[in-house]
């Protein structure tokens, strides 16, 4: 059931980590992996990583994408390797934005 409480020994997954929160590591371990895209001062900011606390991931992953932010979540080792979050579009792109990977 979706709202079931996590088991005491929740499984941990290895995830790709890209972004400021990763320090000098390119992977992390958590209960869910994510890939996110947000618009910050006109830049597309791409990040990847782990939700290390079950409730945190549950909340964020259920949030529907908005014009300024999208998060895609998955469970499985390295499952966010080939996921790139997409902002919702209504047949048009957002003017004045640039792509930017936070490394």
């Amino acid at each position: 059931v979706e709202d079931e409480k996590p088991k005491v020994n929740q499984k941990l997954y290895m995830c790709v980590c890209e972004g400021l929160s990763c320090g000098n590591e390119d992977h992390c371990e958590g209960q869910q992996c994510f890939s996110s895209l947000s618009i910050n001062d006109g830049f597309h900011v791409y990040q990847k990583g782990c939700f290390q606390v079950y409730e945190q991931g549950k909340m964020t992953c259920k949030t529907p994408p908005s014009p300024g932010q999208a998060v895609e979540c998955c469970q499985g080792d390295w499952c966010n390797r080939n996921i790139t979050a997409q902002l919702p579009t209504k047949g048009k792109s957002f003017p004045g934005t640039q792509n930017f990977h936070l490394e």
């Epitope: 371990e29 290390q52 390295w78």
Partner: antibody, heavy 119, light 112 residues
Framework: QVKLLQSGAALVKPGDSIRMSCKAS????????IHWVKQSHGKSLEWIGY????????NYNEKFKSKATLTVDKSSSTAYMEFCRLTSEDSAIYYC????????????WGQGVMVTVSS | DVVMTQTPVSLPVSLGGQASISCRSS???????????LHWYLQKPGQSPQLLIY???NRFSGVPDRFSGSGSGTDFTLKLSRVEPEDLGDYYC?????????FGSGTKLEIK
């Protein structure tokens, strides 16, 4: 089954360099981080660093930063460690180790490479 | 660096008896993800170390239930019940919560 097969023992001169190999089999090489560990004679274990075979990303123990270089060859599922400017302090057994998933720590170890530095 | 203090250095035991090894860390081993990355290894004479217990108390596959791990924060224990000849060797704790990873100095389990 998972195996990490390391290169053979080596006798090297002070000041020389050595490159040892660790050939992985029995699993998808790019899915597991490879760490390297040093064991000096009759002593405990020291962590040298790790390499992510998928990305090539590395992280080193500060103590070994100017001594060790970790690389991989994905096509042959082989990890390498080069040790440079060898001294007698570098005489030891060196292990390559697979870091397991689900927080299991180092789940599989190579058989070790005995390196002797002597003139 | 996190210092792992392992005691005793040597532990003479009788076959069929019990053994207890302690490992203390100089700082908490609770990771930001809530997990505690403290593991135990056995190195038999002439062999590579092998994983016994991961994340404090989880037995690795194939490890008999004579081995058990416990503890939290900075204080951890490995217990062996009904010691058998193949249990003899050097035991090491390892923390992988903080970089650099650090090992305990080892405990030699030997026959009394």
């Amino acid at each position: 089954q998972v195996k990490l097969l390391q290169s053979g023992a080596a006798l090297v001169k002070p000041g020389d360099s050595i490159r040892m190999s660790c050939k992985a089999s029995g699993y998808t090489f790019t899915d597991y981080i490879i760490h390297w560990v040093k064991q000096s004679h009759g002593k405990s274990l020291e962590w040298i660093g790790y390499i992510n075979p998928y990305s090539g990303g590395t992280n080193y123990n500060e103590k070994f930063k100017s001594k060790a270089t970790l690389t991989v060859d994905k096509s042959s599922s082989t990890a390498y460690m080069e040790f440079c400017r060898l001294t007698s302090e570098d005489s030891a057994i060196y292990y390559c180790v697979r870091r397991g998933h689900d927080g299991t720590g180092f789940d599989y170890w190579g058989q070790g490479v005995m390196v002797t530095v002597s003139s | 660096d996190v210092v792992m203090t392992q005691t005793p250095v040597s532990l003479p035991v009788s076959l069929g008896g019990q053994a207890s090894i302690s490992c203390r860390s100089s700082q908490s081993l609770v990771h930001s993800n809530g997990e505690t990355y403290l593991h135990w290894y056995l190195q038999k004479p002439g062999q590579s170390p092998q994983l016994l217990i991961y994340r404090v108390s989880n037995r690795f596959s194939g490890v008999p239930d004579r081995f058990s791990g416990s503890g939290s924060g900075t204080d951890f224990t490995l217990k062996l019940s009904r010691v058998e000849p193949e249990d003899l060797g050097d035991y090491y704790c390892l923390q992988s919560t903080h970089l650099p990873l650090t090992f305990g100095s080892g405990t030699k389990l030997e026959i009394k």
